[in-house]
């Protein structure tokens, strides 16, 4: 009986034309949605001007429908068992199921002149840029629409940049009608232990954002993993969000709609400094705002994201040092809220229900040639927005799932 | 040693262009912007503008905007400034000068404008 | 524009006297003040940059003090060599602007 399952299942999750694996695999069943909370600034006069404590107040959700598109340009390689695929993205915003609408303004940190003064670090440099943000009447904070602030929005210092930079601005600029990708991933056809495991990504076998171990593509996407999941393995996966692979521990059983699932959460460890963590040394790439590598729960991207200063970390800076959070009043962190998990269908390897959360933060520094930075006295890793992409399997889905998979174990 | 090498003196016409290069050694040219200074005859120093050879970025005095060209080679390490539309009173010494704090100077080139 | 006034035009010292040179600002510019020498034929010579940080191989008896709108550039000890033009920058913002500069001359 457990072997003719075993082979059932092995058929089945292999990601080629025919199977159940793959018809969910290239358009996913369940409904994705990404809520953002965005964190209003509500003192940027006095902290511009008296470099006080940053004091936000989270506003949302703000909802949006995502993953709805099927990958594209999906191309199995018989010779080296593995499938490649684009993976295009598109966001529709849910009015129902969001506090307010896209018009709705914020008040957040200048992006363009954060980013700018630090990739610039010149001092002339520095004092153009000043010029042009005195002429266009920019500040180190601006009021933006919750659209302008994900989406792009035409920024009117580096409109007057005279030579060729992207006026365009916004956190996941560009978005709608582009691709993460190419990945290609092992089908499992050979191995199945080695199912949807990435092979390579744009080419690659390594990122080219960081030293040694920290630079590899570990693992899957963390849609799905190998079958016949124990809950003593470390489940690896990679990121494009967070421009690095990171992995999750057991936590616990959880019965998901009458199936019983692994959860799977990140620890608290993969966010350590290397004091704590060794492995995590290649994840500090600079001494000044890390205090030499002892900071820990944030993750400079810069490298990644053309110089711009952006740090990711967990809602709230969650598991992240006192000093990250210290120039921050409002955080109230909290693991249930905050933390990201993976519920795992054991046998398929399948992800039946998420909660993947990050927050995007950007890094400002005290400018003594640019005016509305000049009063800084210290560096602020500032929180715009942090989010929640959930994904839970149908309740159609989910008894499929019992009478074919789980109810037939049992 | 550090050291900026400015081309010859020059004799031009009203209405023509002039343009003088200075040369830098002893240094990385990208690392450091080139300020660009003159001085008329028995005048004060005047800031006309500066390029950084890195990033390409340039600022020029209101005065000058329009009639003077900065640019920078890299490759060869030569910073050079043109001046269009020359008049009587563009009669100067034209320096090049390193950095924000003019740390380093050419020797100065001469630039007489006369019918 | 950050407008530099320096003053006196012209002064007159003796080998061994102390002299000051004043710029003032119009708008505040910290301490970014740099303070020149230039003799007859030559490129001026940076003596003394932002912060009052005397150059590498600039004599002790040259200083600077000052902050905001505020400077003063102090010669103790005069000496012969001495005699010169020096002229203050302002470096915080765009455009760079000098003072009209000093004639000191030694007696």
């Known amino acids: 009986g457990d072997l003719l399952i075993q082979k059932t299942i092995k058929k089945q999750v292999v990601l080629e034309e025919g199977t159940i694996a793959f018809k969910n695999w290239v358009k996913t069943g369940t409904e994705v949605y990404r809520q953002f909370w965005i964190f209003d600034v509500q003192n940027p006069q006095e902290v511009m001007m008296n470099s006080s404590n940053i004091q936000v107040k989270q506003r949302g959700p703000y909802t949006y429908r995502v993953r709805f598109l099927a990958k594209e340009n999906v191309t199995q390689d018989a010779e080296d068992n593995t499938v490649s695929f684009l993976q295009p993205n598109g966001a529709i915003f849910e009015p129902s199921l969001s506090v307010g609408t896209e018009a709705d303004n914020f008040t957040v940190l200048n992006l363009a002149v954060a980013a700018a003064s630090h990739i610039y670090q010149n001092q002339f440099v520095q004092m153009i840029l000043n010029s042009l943000i005195n002429k266009s009447k920019s500040s180190m904070f601006q009021v933006r629409t919750l659209r302008e602030l994900l989406w792009g929005y035409r920024d009117p210092f580096l409109s007057l940049v005279p030579y060729p930079v992207t006026t365009t601005v916004g956190l996941f600029y560009p978005y709608n009608n582009t691709a993460d990708g190419v990945y290609k991933v092992f089908n499992g056809k050979d191995n199945i232990s080695k199912v949807a495991i990435i092979d390579t990504y744009k080419g690659k076998r390594n990122l080219s954002y960081w030293e040694s171990h920290c630079d590899m593509i570990n693992g899957t996407d963390a849609a799905s993993f190998p079958p016949f999941v124990e809950k003593s393995q470390v489940l690896q996966f990679f990121s494009s969000d967070i421009c690095r692979s990171i992995y999750a521990v057991f936590e616990s059983d959880v019965n998901l709609k009458g199936i019983p699932v692994y959860r799977f959460v990140l620890p608290s460890k993969a966010f350590a400094s290397p004091v704590e963590n060794p492995d995590n040394y290649c994840f500090c790439t600079e001494k000044i705002i890390s205090k030499n590598c002892t900071s820990y729960g944030v993750l400079d991207i810069s490298k990644c994201k053309e110089g711009r200063p952006v740090y990711i970390s967990l809602p709230h800076f969650l598991y992240a040092s006192p000093d990250v959070s210290e120039p921050i009043d409002g955080l109230n962190p909290n693991e249930e809220e905050h933390r990201t998990y993976l519920d795992i269908e054991p046998i398929t390897g399948f992800t039946l229900q998420f909660a993947k959360r990050l927050q995007v933060n950007l890094l400002v520094k005290p400018s003594e040639k640019i005016q509305v930075l000049k009063n800084l006295k210290r560096n602020y890793i500032v929180p715009i927005l942090w989010l929640n992409e959930t994904g839970t399997i149908g309740d159609e889905k989910a008894n499929m799932f019992r009478s074919q998979v789980t109810g037939k174990i049992n | 040693e550090v050291q900026l090498v400015q081309s010859g003196a020059e004799v031009k016409k009203p209405g023509s262009s002039v343009k003088v290069s200075c040369k830098a050694s002893?240094?990385?040219?990208?690392?450091?912007?080139m300020q660009w200074v003159r001085q008329a005859p028995g005048q004060g120093l005047e800031w006309m503008g500066g390029?950084?050879?890195?990033?390409?970025?340039?600022a020029y005095a209101q005065k000058f905007q329009g009639r003077v060209t900065l640019t920078a080679d890299k490759s060869t390490s030569t910073a050079y400034m043109e001046l269009s539309s020359l008049r009587s009173e563009d009669t100067a010494v034209y320096y090049c000068?390193?950095?924000?704090?003019?740390?380093?100077w050419g020797q100065g080139t001469l630039v007489t404008v006369s019918s | 524009e950050t407008t530099v006034t320096q003053s006196p035009a012209f002064m007159s010292a003796t080998p061994g006297d102390k002299v000051t040179i004043s710029c003032i600002t119009s708008?505040?510019?910290?301490?970014?003040m740099n303070w020149y020498q230039q003799k007859p034929g030559e490129p001026p010579k940076l003596l003394i940059s932002?912060?009052?940080t005397l150059r590498p191989g600039v004599p002790s008896r040259f200083s600077s003090s000052g902050y905001g709108t505020d400077f003063t550039f102090t010669i103790n000890n005069i000496e012969s060599e001495d005699a010169a033009y020096y002229y203050c920058?302002?470096?915080?913002?765009?455009?760079?602007?000098f003072g009209q500069g000093t004639k000191l001359e030694i007696k």
């Open positions: 920058l302002q470096s915080d913002n765009l455009p760079l602007t």
């Open positions: 390029i950084d050879p890195e990033t390409g970025g340039i």
């Open positions: 932002e912060g009052s």
């Open positions: 000068t390193r950095k924000l704090d003019f740390d380093y």
């Open positions: 708008t505040d510019i910290d301490d970014d």
């Open positions: 002893g240094y990385r040219f990208s690392d450091y912007e």
